[in-house]
């Protein structure tokens, strides 16, 4: 079954998140500075004519681009689009921003710059003060806080009104840790790296972030193909070669926002066995309630059956038995030369009275700081390989 039950559909995650309709209160909108109280952050709501008709920063955004408008969504959301406008001022406003950058945070401390699938950070904005320009964020960002940084190519006044569109991040997944995806060499190179991962990469390990395995995009039967335009072969999948893992498995760790009772994990896998991709032979998961705590009880083991000869990509459901945890560590056993995953999601319920790691207050310092990766993670033997692509210019597979 190729369906990802309990898995969010990014095409349906496009709701206005509350700037225009004021469900985001003024207290959750802030800014680095403003011209005056009449152009304060609270006046930055899309289609609003409050105050002098927009947020306008006091400082120049050229050349430093340090001024920002911040929206606190209070809970983690998947932000799939943003909309911008210039200053209204009863039709007299002339200020708008032709381009801008976005930064986002899940915890209020670590900020990531949004980039498109080809590594471009600058977003085209408005051409006039009144028109609304929507930007489809590919990839979308999982964020609680979003900052808009208006840009200009000379000293000039810029003003912004904004809206964010998306949906609540119900999965509760804060980050996953995994070995860096590898390159498969067929008649052409197939790049199976996690090209939108927003965490850290150290010594062949990615940790502290989210990426393509949690973006809602399910890969095709033929992992060389993608529905995305101008992307390299293998784009939708993250993959690992059996040759690089003497242990016979790939180990991943998942961190969640709060204690949850886990019913199942859904892993969308490729099974194009004529090209070496096979479903995992089995999955083994361990559970713990906190970062420094011991793994609890026996691991959950699940052997995979089904029609392994069927080349269709499919979602594999791994029962997790209602085990309660905030951290999961899962081992995916190789059953062939390659493991290729396009999406991992979880079916879980928040345990009542569990205090959130993210919510009204921010969590304690992250358990894996932006330094060396955890020492208790299985050592990886990664074969040398060429530079992995992060972006692709048209006509070039890796540029």
């Amino acid at each position: 079954d190729a369906d990802m039950k309990g898995h969010f559909d990014p095409a349906k995650c496009r709701y206005a998140l509350g700037m225009q309709d004021r469900t985001i209160p003024d207290s959750d909108i802030s800014a680095s500075s403003s011209w005056s109280d009449s152009t304060a952050a609270r006046h930055s709501r899309l289609e609003s004519s409050d105050g002098d008709g927009a947020w306008c920063p006091a400082g120049s955004v050229f050349p430093k681009e340090e001024e920002y408008l911040q929206v606190d969504l209070q809970r983690l959301h998947l932000v799939a689009l943003v909309g911008t406008q210039g200053r209204h001022a009863g039709g007299l406003g002339k200020e708008f921003s032709r381009s801008y950058r976005l930064r986002y945070s899940r915890d209020g401390r670590r900020w990531m710059g949004w980039k498109d699938r080809w590594g471009q950070e600058v977003i085209s904005g408005n051409e006039d003060p009144e028109g609304v320009v929507l930007k489809d964020l590919g990839p979308p960002m999982v964020a609680r806080l979003v900052r808009f940084y208006p840009r200009a190519d000379r000293v000039m006044s810029v003003c912004l009104r904004v809206e964010l569109y998306g949906c609540l991040w119900r999965d509760g997944l804060l980050s996953y840790t995994a070995p860096v995806g590898q390159t498969m060499y067929l008649s052409e190179a197939v790049y199976l790296n996690d090209s939108t991962y927003d965490g850290h990469t150290v010594g062949g390990l990615q940790y502290g972030g989210l990426g393509q395995l949690a973006d809602g995009v399910v890969g095709l039967d033929d992992f060389r193909k993608s529905q995305e335009l101008r992307v390299w072969p293998g784009y939708d999948y993250v993959g690992w070669s059996n040759h690089s893992f003497s242990s016979g498995y790939v180990e991943m760790e998942f961190e969640f926002d709060r204690l949850r009772a886990f019913q199942a994990m859904q892993v969308h896998c490729n099974n194009m066995h004529t090209l070496g991709a096979r479903l995992p032979g089995g999955v083994e998961c361990r559970f713990r309630r906190g970062p420094a705590m011991a793994w609890e009880g026996e691991p959950m083991r699940h052997n995979l059956g089904g029609n392994l000869g069927d080349p269709r990509a499919r979602a594999v459901s791994v029962p997790l038995g209602g085990r309660v945890a905030r951290f999961l560590q899962c081992r995916f056993l190789f059953a062939g030369p390659w493991l290729l995953f396009s999406e991992i999601s979880f079916i879980s319920d928040v345990v009542n009275n569990s205090s959130p790691a993210l919510g009204g207050t921010f969590p304690p310092a992250p358990w894996w700081p932006p330094g060396p990766p955890p020492t208790n993670f299985s050592s990886l033997e990664l074969e040398p390989r060429g530079q992995q692509p992060v972006a692709k210019a048209e006509g070039s597979p890796t540029a």
């Epitope: 190729a2 095709l220 039967d221 033929d222 193909k225 993608s226 529905q227 995305e228 335009l229 194009m272 066995h273 004529t274 090209l275 000869g309 080349p311 269709r312 990509a313």
Partner: antibody, heavy 116, light 110 residues
């Protein structure tokens, strides 16, 4: 070249197997597909088989057709034909070995008539 | 379910004219689209692959364009030999698909 055979007049419910024979090319290097065309109608994809024997079929064709292959032939079995299965059946070679992509070589087709 | 919708169903143009055939996919298929020409009593013949690439031996009067969900086949300087039915075909996915072909467009050359 690619050539279909086995097309004939049969009564409804009588199983029928069509065979696609390839000459001059290495069949083991390509995915192969069956496509049909009812009189005066458009092209209708039935299914594809790749070099490992993995198959895909049209949603409407499931359970009604079986595709298999040997080192030299690709067969299409119509398990229980109905009058609506009357058509010219084409065998087509894909550009790729592993999945349907596009068809670079077609057979001339074989006519199947289902009539009581 | 991925569906290809071809328009128009039929078009008539004089010799030397230009015909434009559109193929719309119900979801994005990147550039995985091909075009075929079929004449009565013959199998289809590949014209264009990967949305815009001309197949071997096909005259440059045939031009494919588009990406995502909207694709176009343009035939310029029409000749009598171009009278045929033209089909688009998606090559991105064959899972849970009714048909990988569009419904076809008949081109009549006057």
């Amino acid at each position: 070249s690619v050539k279909e055979s086995g097309g004939r007049l049969v009564t409804p419910g009588t199983p029928l197997t069509l065979t696609c024979t390839v000459s001059g090319i290495d069949l083991s290097s390509y995915a192969m597909s069956w496509v049909r065309q009812a009189p005066g109608k458009g092209l209708e994809w039935i299914g594809t088989i790749n070099i490992g024997g993995g198959t895909w079929d049209a949603t409407w064709a499931r359970g009604r057709f079986t595709i298999s292959r040997t080192s030299t032939t690709v067969d299409l079995k119509i398990t229980s034909p109905t009058i609506g299965d009357t058509a010219t059946y084409f065998c087509a070679r894909d550009v790729d070995a592993h999945t349907l992509t596009y068809f670079t070589l077609w057979g001339p087709g074989t006519l199947v008539t289902i009539s009581s | 379910e991925l569906v290809l919708t071809q328009t128009p169903a039929s078009v008539s143009e004089p010799v030397g004219g230009t015909v434009t055939i559109k193929c719309q996919a119900s979801q994005t298929i990147s550039s995985w689209l091909s075009w075929y020409q079929q004449k009565p009593g013959q199998p289809p013949k590949l014209l264009i692959y990967y949305a815009f690439n001309l197949a071997s031996g096909v005259p440059s009067r045939f031009k494919g364009s588009g990406s995502g969900t909207e694709f176009t086949l343009t035939i310029s300087d029409l000749e009598c030999a171009d009278a045929a039915t033209y089909y688009c075909q998606q090559g991105i996915s064959s899972s849970n698909v009714d048909n990988v072909f569009g419904g076809g467009t008949e081109v009549v050359v006057k």
